[in-house]
């Protein structure tokens, strides 16, 4: 009764198609699969960035898999063949592992790469990234930004750089069609006549770095003798009302400061008839229903009421 064995997949490799971190893992079927002609072979693939504690694991019937990686670090992957018991008339059989690694040979010392990279997707419309030059690099150093997301045929270079002293220190992106809710990959590399410049890689999702415009049309309405309703409108632009959270700052008679976070474009405030002045400002942020993270907008213009009984009029800025 001979033990059934199966070989690991052949020609296991990680291929870089030039998408700045989105890599292809591919392989060929194991040798000597003839014994298992009626079998559907499966593969268990494990992969991670070098230095990561945990492996990502998938099982597939395919000969390829694609995923995103941090190219600032190396990548390691391993794969083996799986035979379900139906293939062997007995128990599960798995091969030994085939292993492979991939990394981009780093040029230049780490200090030469861009510092303080910051990207903001203004009002879910305009992406702007800015950075500072590497430490100790000379003025002849210039940086170039490339980006890619699923839907683009190839990585594109920034065409509208922000400059300071002749150096590129940022990029204004063009309209990015169908670019949210997917990984957005950026590489900033550089060139200098004096020394090699280290490349930097970044990955994020655009909906998570949105900074909306502030709310507009702030108004007061007296609801009752002891209640005032504060209202405002969502800022102009593509962000739907369901995607906003708001923070309100209310000042009563220059002393009391109330802050509150709400999901709707209204807030009811308890007041007394003695209130002589009421001011409030609002700011907005994309909420958890539409993103995993976000940036608060600037505060709106201040809206104030003072002096006159609020029951007699509604104030509209």
């Amino acid at each position: 009764d001979t033990e059934i064995k199966v070989n690991p997949p052949q020609d296991f490799e990680i291929v870089d198609p030039g998408y700045l971190g989105y890599l292809y893992l591919q392989w060929q079927p194991p040798l000597s699969l003839d014994h298992f002609k009626e079998c559907t072979v499966e593969y268990e693939l494990k992969y991670r960035n070098i230095g990561s504690e945990t492996w990502k694991t998938i099982i597939t019937k395919n000969l390829h898999y694609k995923d995103g990686f941090d190219l600032n670090k190396g990548i390691e992957a391993k794969i083996h063949t799986l035979l379900p018991w139906q293939c062997t008339n007995g128990s599960e059989v798995q091969s030994s592992w085939a292993e492979t690694t991939y990394w981009i040979s780093p040029q230049g010392i780490p200090e030469t790469k861009v510092q303080d990279m910051d990207c903001v997707y203004y009002n879910w419309q305009y992406l702007l990234c800015s950075w500072k030059p590497g430490i100790g690099v000379l003025l002849d150093t210039n940086y170039n930004l490339f980006y890619w997301y699923e839907g683009l045929d190839h990585a594109l270079q920034c065409v509208d750089y922000i400059k300071a002293d002749g150096q590129n220190i940022g990029c204004r992106f063009p309209y990015l069609e169908a670019s949210d809710y997917k990984d957005f990959y950026i590489c900033v590399n550089g060139s200098s006549e004096n020394k090699p410049i280290r490349s930097s890689y970044f990955t994020f999702q655009l909906q998570n770095i949105v900074k909306p415009l502030p709310p507009v049309y702030l108004t007061f309405t007296r609801e009752s003798s002891c209640e005032i309703k504060l209202k405002w409108s969502i800022p102009l632009g593509p962000i739907p009302a369901r995607c906003f959270d708001y923070e309100i700052e209310i000042r009563e008679d220059d002393t009391t400061l109330v802050t509150a976070t709400v999901e709707n474009e209204t807030y009811t405030l308890k007041t007394t008839n003695e209130t002589r002045q009421l001011c409030f400002v609002v700011r907005s942020k994309v909420n958890i229903y539409c993103s995993d993270d976000g940036i608060w907008s600037e505060w709106s213009d201040k809206q104030c009421w003072e002096g006159e009984d609020l029951s007699k009029k509604t104030l509209l800025r």
Epitope: I59, T60, K61, N62, Y65, P84, W85, Q86, S91, E92
Partner: antibody
Framework: EVQLLESGGGLVQPGGSLRLSCAAS????????LNWVRQAPGKGLEWVSA????????FYADSVKGRFTISRDNSKNTLYLQMNSLRAEDTAVYYC??????WGAGAFDYWGQGTLVTVSS | DIQMTQSPSTLSASVGDRVTITCRAS??????LAWYQQKPGKAPKLLIY???SLESGVPSRFSGSGSGTEFTLTISSLQPDDFATYYC??????????FGQGTKVEIK
């Protein structure tokens, strides 16, 4: 005749724990991969977790990773799902399902009748 | 993750009608697709596996076709017992295993 019978459901507070069991009969238990699939009230099917026949390989949906643990006792023909740090969104009928062919998951040819887990304060 | 999209969400039909439900995968899944029928308060029941193979005991009026990203479940002549919700499911690559959102077949 293949039979899968879930138990262990009930009402639990958010943050609480529960252990579901699935007693199996009618097939060679230690060979087949088994899965948990859940269905929130009025919603569709959502895959939760899978375990290979030997128990050596386990897989989880992102929504439960780190909170739920799948295991099996091949001597008792029983599948388990240990659920910790329960949330309101875990409220669902939980089904155990047998894989027709495959290492960890695949087409599910037999299902239990389900057990209801309600997470509420 | 592989997304599965079913259409329509609801389908009104009469006994004897030919009914077709479509399932689309966000990427190629070869033929690794199953179809299930579920009735209220009951567990799902496997109808079709490997895109077109009829599960044992399932009436021959049910058939599946397609490969790659486009799949269909056809009921050649709808019977009273067939009014239910139908789900497709991919098992090409996991985790996660993913299901379509379901198609409810109701009486016209």
């Amino acid at each position: 005749e293949v039979q899968l019978l879930e138990s262990g459901g009930g009402l639990v507070q958010p943050g609480g724990s529960l252990r579901l069991s699935c007693a199996a009969s009618g097939f060679t238990f230690s060979r087949d991969a088994l899965n948990w699939v859940r269905q929130a009230p009025g919603k569709g099917l959502e895959w939760v977790s899978a375990i290979s026949g030997s128990g050596g390989s386990t897989f989880y949906a992102d929504s439960v990773k780190g909170r739920f643990t799948i295991s099996r006792d091949n001597s008792k023909n029983t599948l388990y799902l240990q659920m910790n740090s329960l949330r309101a969104e875990d409220t669902a009928v939980y089904y155990c399902a047998k894989v027709r062919y495959g290492w960890g998951a695949g087409a599910f040819d037999y299902w239990g009748q389900g057990t209801l887990v309600t997470v509420s304060s | 993750d592989i997304q599965m999209t079913q259409s329509p969400s609801t389908l009104s039909a009469s006994v004897g009608d030919r009914v077709t439900i479509t399932c689309r995968a966000s990427q190629s899944i070869s033929s690794w697709l199953a179809w299930y029928q579920q009735k209220p308060g009951k567990a799902p029941k496997l109808l079709i596996y490997d895109a077109s193979s009829l599960e044992s005991g399932v009436p021959s009026r049910f058939s599946g076709s397609g490969s790659g990203t486009e799949f269909t479940l056809t009921i050649s002549s709808l019977q009273p017992d067939d009014f239910a919700t139908y789900y497709c499911q991919q098992y090409d690559t996991y985790p996660p295993i993913t299901f379509g959102q379901g198609t409810k077949v109701e009486i016209k």
